[in-house]
């Protein structure tokens, strides 16, 4: 089971109307450029076999991947939203840095790896899709971690 006390984010992180709005605006703008609507990155398959107490740890992995492999490389796009949203998500990632799981997390890594593989396989359009799902990432992170 996770060390629950470290796999938590305060509700106040998600009660900031301005940055919430900017995150959703960024997602909306990117989703308009996403022409692959058949694939969803953040959905049932990502959470398959993951218990309630493990969800935040899983979302931490997804957040870190999204920051490092998607948002940082695409940081010059979708301005002015990107320059505001990226530091906000990076702060959340930093607050989850001590969130770990004791024991086997193979099932979680497997699920996250499938998401990573999908993004990589789609190339730049995979990165655009991931940005277009930042609203889902925001909400899933909130629901899993508060």
């Amino acid at each position: 089971a996770p060390i629950s006390s470290h796999c938590r984010l305060d509700k106040s992180n998600f009660q900031q109307p301005y940055i919430t709005n900017r995150t959703f605006m960024l997602a909306k703008e990117a989703s308009l450029a996403d022409n692959n609507t058949d694939v969803r990155l953040i959905g049932e398959k990502l959470f398959h076999g993951v218990s309630m107490s493990e969800r935040c740890y899983l979302m931490k992995q997804v957040l870190n991947f999204t920051l490092e492999e998607v948002l940082f490389p695409q940081s010059d796009r979708f301005q002015p939203y990107m320059q505001e949203v990226v530091p906000f998500l990076a702060r959340l990632s930093n607050r989850l840095s001590t969130c770990h799981i004791e024991g086997d997390d193979l099932h979680i890594q497997r699920n996250v790896q499938k998401l990573k593989d999908t993004v990589k396989k789609l190339g730049e359009s995979g990165e655009i899709k991931a940005i277009g799902e930042l609203d889902l990432l925001f909400m899933s992170l909130r629901n899993a971690c508060i």
């Epitope: 909400m139 899933s140 909130r142």
Partner: antibody
């Protein structure tokens, strides 16, 4: 094909006990949480409780103490044990699969089993 | 605990009509709202989640909108098979788990 079939309902006297079963097929209980919901005659839906993938259980505040959810993964069956039953517990009881997609959604549902508490 | 208030509690409409049902939450639930359809003597069926995402196999005449406290379910052109009761359902996180899932009181859509 995913299927959920409830059984065990019937007539029970006030103060009595009943155990409902929800037999699932087409998926594993080690991959999905399961919920129980009830519906009194002519009324709306009321959440009772949930059993998570790891066996943890959570209950609505009104259900704590009288209602217990358990499962037998080898039989692919979830149970709802109901004790100290009252007339107001008369309802159709449903089990449903909890699909977490970033938010909890309940899909599909069983056909329901009717519990009548009366003397 | 979050309270979901649906309105109207019942309505009469004809085939082809545009029907709108609202669901108001007593506190901010973001987009953590789902809609279910229930026909008499049957189990509820998932229609919409994330407030606006159509569940698999659900006809496109159904749509959902809203966030925060105010949500809407719209049926663009009512079909005979749509006469049923509709429930909204919220998932609330971060509070006590004993009030995580809440249903609205339901809206019965009847034939005019």
């Amino acid at each position: 094909e995913v299927q959920l079939v409830e059984s065990g309902g019937g007539l029970v006297q006030p103060g009595g006990s009943l155990r409902l079963s929800c037999a699932v097929s087409g998926f594993s209980l080690s991959s999905y949480a399961m919920i129980w919901v009830r519906q009194a005659p002519g009324k709306g839906l009321e959440w009772i409780g949930i059993i998570d993938i790891d066996g943890s259980t959570y209950y609505a505040s009104w259900a704590k103490g009288r209602f217990t959810i358990s499962r037998d993964s080898s039989k692919n069956t979830v149970y709802l044990q109901m004790n100290s039953l009252r007339a107001e517990d008369t309802a159709v009881y449903y089990c449903a699969r909890d699909r977490f997609v970033g938010v909890d959604i309940f899909d599909p549902w069983g056909q329901g089993t009717l519990v009548t508490v009366s003397s | 605990a979050v309270v979901l208030t649906q309105s109207p509690s019942s309505l009469s409409a004809s085939v082809g009509d545009r029907v709108t049902i609202t669901c108001q939450a007593s506190e901010d639930i973001y987009t953590n709202l789902a809609w279910y359809q229930q026909k008499p003597g049957k189990a509820p069926k998932l229609l919409i989640y994330w407030a606006s995402t159509l569940a698999s196999g659900v006809p496109s005449r159904f749509s959902g909108s809203g966030s925060g406290t105010d949500f809407t379910l719209t049926i663009s052109s009512l079909q005979p098979e749509d006469f049923a009761t509709y429930y909204c359902q919220a998932s609330v996180y971060g509070n006590s788990a004993d009030s995580r899932y809440t249903f609205g009181g339901g809206t019965k859509v009847e034939i005019k």
